[in-house]
């Protein structure tokens, strides 16, 4: 199972639920669904209040129980380490795959933390991060921001990923903007 890691803003916008949580307990495999269930302790929720309704406490995260079908494997054994988890809601349950954005909170740049906390949501409605994977690539729309990190650095941990968000400049136009300048 292979997938191109998304820009964190894309991960935020395309997810139903974005939370900060610790992985606790041993994973369990469900004998009916063949999903593996990780027990988590949620510490913060950044997106999904409306989707969840009253069930605002997520205690488990679900993933296919085999690697070849994009199951997520949690490698850290540190139960006090916090992770940013961006996933999909299916029947009220949080699902993630290898392709989901799951990262140690401490590994995120200050700008990314700010993005998840308050800024990425501003760009969700109107703006699109458009991956540029090979030259030439051009903007399909004024609301697109060309994401060239992978092209230039061969890594998703490039400058645009760590420091920029694609945000509305004016109606019908989105541009890369520094998350540093978004400090309230």
């Amino acid at each position: 199972c292979t997938c191109v890691p998304p820009h964190p803003q894309t991960a935020f916008c395309n997810s139903d639920l974005v939370i900060r949580a610790k992985f606790v307990g041993t994973p369990e495999v469900n004998q009916t669904t063949l999903y593996q269930r990780y027990e988590i302790k949620m510490t913060k929720m950044y997106k999904g209040f409306q989707a969840l309704g009253d069930a605002a406490d997520i205690r488990f995260v679900y993933t296919p129980a085999m690697e070849s079908v994009c199951g997520y494997f949690h490698r850290s054994h540190n139960r006090s380490e916090e992770f940013l988890i961006a996933g999909k809601l299916q029947d009220g349950l949080l699902h993630i795959t290898t392709c989901s954005f799951v990262a140690p909170w401490n590994s995120l740049s200050l700008a990314q933390r700010r993005g998840f906390t308050k800024t990425y949501t501003v760009g969700c409605e109107e703006c699109t991060v458009f991956p540029c994977l090979s030259i030439p690539c051009k903007l399909q729309s004024g609301t697109h921001c060309l994401w060239t990190d992978q092209l230039l650095q061969g890594s998703e941990k490039g400058f645009q990923s760590r420091h920029l968000a694609c945000l509305p400049r004016e109606p019908g136009l989105c541009t890369w903007q520094s998350l540093r300048s978004q400090i309230a």
Epitope: V29, Q31, T32, T33, L34, A65, M66, E67
Partner: antibody, heavy 113, light 111 residues
Framework: QVQLVESGGGLVQPGGSLRLSCAAS????????MSWVRQAPGKGLEWVSG????????FYADSVKGRFTISRDNSKNTLYLQMNSLRAEDTAVYYC??????WGQGTLVTVSS | DIALTQPASVSGSPGQSITISCTGT?????????VSWYQQHPGKAPKLMIY???NRPSGVSNRFSGSKSGNTASLTISGLQAEDEADYYC??????????FGGGTKLTVLG
């Protein structure tokens, strides 16, 4: 009581196809993931494929990926294994298992020219 | 390509206790509490004797017990009886290969 009865085994030439069936009774079929496990003559057990209760998640062992297809019909309480491009090394007794707690008696598949 | 390592054979006299080991890695036996043990008599289907490391299905004698330490699981049969003579297989969940088996251990109950 739980009962699993396999059928469809037999002699087939290399490159040929065969479809195994497993009729289940004595439990709520759709509530359990099912698996196929095989055992070559005089050898140990090898997991082949698995399918979730609703048929959404499907897993294969690398040795059969791209050649075998697992499926289920919950309305008929039946599990299937479609085997294509069969090889001599696929010769084995094929067992159908409810998760891994109850097993059928197996059906012999022989791949030989 | 056997994933879990078991001794090829083990023997004991009636009334004795024997232990069969099953060694894996932190990715299978050591990483999850999903170890099962099966008994297989010649020409018969495998029968589940132990699941989730140490649990016995109903109908299985309490002479059979399972345990795990690190990457090694063990099946202990106490008060050995003639009908215990069979092949025994361990099995573990593995995230990459889903389900893996040991190579099997032939248990002989000495006359």
């Amino acid at each position: 009581q739980v009962q699993l009865v396999e059928s469809g085994g037999g002699l087939v030439q290399p490159g040929g196809s065969l479809r195994l069936s497993c009729a289940a009774s004595g439990f709520t079929f759709s509530s359990y993931a099912m698996s196929w496990v095989r055992q070559a003559p005089g050898k140990g057990l090898e997991w082949v494929s698995g399918i979730s209760g609703n048929g959404v998640l499907i897993f294969y062992a690398d040795s059969v990926k791209g050649r075998f297809t697992i499926s289920r019909d919950n309305s008929k309480n039946t599990l299937y294994l479609q085997m294509n491009s069969l090889r001599a090394e696929d010769t084995a007794v094929y067992y159908c298992a409810r998760w891994f707690d109850h097993w059928g008696q197996g059906t012999l598949v022989t791949v030989s020219s | 390509d056997i994933a879990l390592t078991q001794p090829a054979s083990v023997s004991g006299s009636p009334g004795q206790s024997i232990t069969i080991s099953c060694t894996g890695t932190s990715s299978d036996v050591g990483g999850y509490n999903y170890v099962s043990w099966y008994q297989q008599h010649p020409g018969k289907a495998p029968k589940l004797m132990i699941y989730d490391v140490s649990n016995r299905p109903s109908g299985v004698s309490n002479r059979f017990s399972g345990s795990k330490s690190g990457n090694t699981a063990s099946l202990t049969i106490s008060g050995l009886q003639a009908e215990d003579e069979a092949d025994y297989y361990c099995q573990s969940y593995d995230f990459v290969r889903f389900m893996v088996f040991g190579g099997g251990t032939k248990l002989t109950v000495l006359g």
